[in-house]
């Protein structure tokens, strides 16, 4: 299972108008459920039981954005509508160039992720945990726009990371 | 269906402001992106500003400085507030539907603001 | 700013082949997403998603319509050319902010 180096770019707009770019890093791991690759994209938050809505409609999500998904407690949601895998595979359906999960709260998802699924998805599928998904959480409930790029080799310069 | 309806339009004189809406119906609003793109007659299209599915915004530079986007998810409607109203503003506002690295994949039909005295 | 140029005016017999092109200032691709996107607007109605992320056709567009190109240089193409396609074309890229159009293409037909 790789490292998954994602920067996380967030636009701070000032009441002139003009905007402020912070920029921090944090790490993940590739799941094998998609594949070991650089994305990049919008962070769009998603609520686990917003992926089990099938309305056609909805499912007309816009072409290029990064899925975060904060994982609950398996007990909160004994019967989901659908696996760690299904919710990734939605995700990708809509739209998304890669899905991050926060696993702090449900770390058995890992291994849901990591079964070695005989079709993988496309798109990278990563999760996060402990230090790293609380910095990415707390960039995420922020209201600012934020975009992430995902690496599987750390980035070439070093980022002035800002603490979020 | 997806819809984007915006309202507000019409003549306003040079110096005042205006707040013009955009009503959006079929999609989960609060769920998406959505932006703020004008027209003047016969020029090509301009980028005004973003609103976040999480409320976040940035603004383009054409009219920096003047502009509020804000949205209420509550009643599915998108805002534009722009001030200090001049002739150059004179356009077809339209909202159009996209994350801030997505394609803009459906507007609305626009609304004519004229500026003038 | 990312600016985006564009060929003004073109002018095209029916049936035949063109090709409208849009330079960028800066590199536009993204990991594993493509930061360009085109748009086609006719006389008097709103502009209308062609081609986004370079070269993916935008649902119920017909095939005659393509794009391609990475980086700094980007074409749409159009083959064959119908009566029907007369209008404005436009190139918007979303790699950076302020997001931003090309000025536009006017296809003519001769």
């Known amino acids: 299972k790789e490292t998954a180096f994602v920067e996380v770019v967030l636009f701070e707009s000032s009441p002139s108008g003009d905007y402020t770019t912070y920029t921090t890093g944090l790490t993940g791991r590739f799941s094998r459920a998609g594949a070991t690759l650089s994305a990049e994209g919008e962070i769009v938050q998603m609520h686990p039981l917003g992926l089990c809505n099938n309305n056609d409609e909805e499912d007309l999500y816009e072409y290029g954005w990064v899925g975060v998904v904060k994982l609950e407690q398996p007990e909160l949601d004994p019967k989901p509508c659908l696996t760690v895998l299904g919710k990734a595979k939605r995700a990708v359906q809509r739209g998304a160039t890669a899905v991050i999960f926060d696993v702090s709260e449900n770390p058995e998802a890992i291994d849901q992720l990591n079964q070695g699924s005989e079709d993988p998805l496309k798109r990278p599928v990563v999760y996060v945990k402990g230090a790293d998904a609380i910095k990415l959480m707390n960039i995420v409930n922020k209201q600012k726009v934020a975009r992430a790029r995902i690496q599987h080799r750390p980035p070439r310069q070093p980022t002035e990371y800002f603490d979020m | 269906e997806v819809q984007l309806v915006e309202s507000g339009g019409g003549l306003v004189q040079p110096g005042k402001s205006l707040r013009l809406s955009c009503s959006a119906s079929?999609?989960?609003?609060?769920?998406?992106?959505l932006h703020w793109i004008r027209q003047a007659p016969g020029k090509g299209l301009d980028w005004l500003g973003y609103s976040s599915s999480n409320s976040g915004t940035v603004y383009g530079d054409a009219v920096k400085g003047r502009v509020t986007i804000s949205r209420d998810n509550a009643k599915n409607t998108l805002y534009l507030q722009l001030n200090s109203l001049k002739s150059e503003d004179t356009a077809i506002y339209y909202c159009?539907?996209?994350?801030?690295?997505?394609?803009?994949?459906?507007w609305g039909q626009g609304t004519l603001v004229t500026v003038s005295s | 700013d990312i600016v985006l140029t564009q060929s003004p005016a073109l002018a095209v017999s029916l049936g035949q082949r063109v090709t409208i092109s849009c330079k960028a200032s800066?590199?536009?691709?993204?990991?594993?997403?493509?930061?360009m996107h085109w748009y086609q607007q006719k006389p008097g109605q709103k502009p209308k998603l062609l081609i986004f992320?370079?070269?993916n056709l935008a649902s119920g567009i017909p095939a005659r319509f393509s794009g391609s190109g990475s980086g700094t240089d980007f074409t749409l193409t159009i083959d064959p050319v119908e009566t029907d396609d007369i209008a404005t074309y436009y190139c918007?890229?979303?790699?950076?902010?302020?997001?931003?159009f090309g000025s536009g293409s006017r296809l003519e037909i001769t």
């Open positions: 079929g999609f989960t609003f609060s769920n998406y992106g």
């Open positions: 159009a539907r996209g994350y801030s690295s997505s394609p803009f994949a459906y």
């Open positions: 992320a370079g070269s």
């Open positions: 800066q590199n536009v691709d993204g990991f594993g997403i493509g930061y």
């Open positions: 918007q890229q979303n790699k950076d902010f302020p997001l931003t």
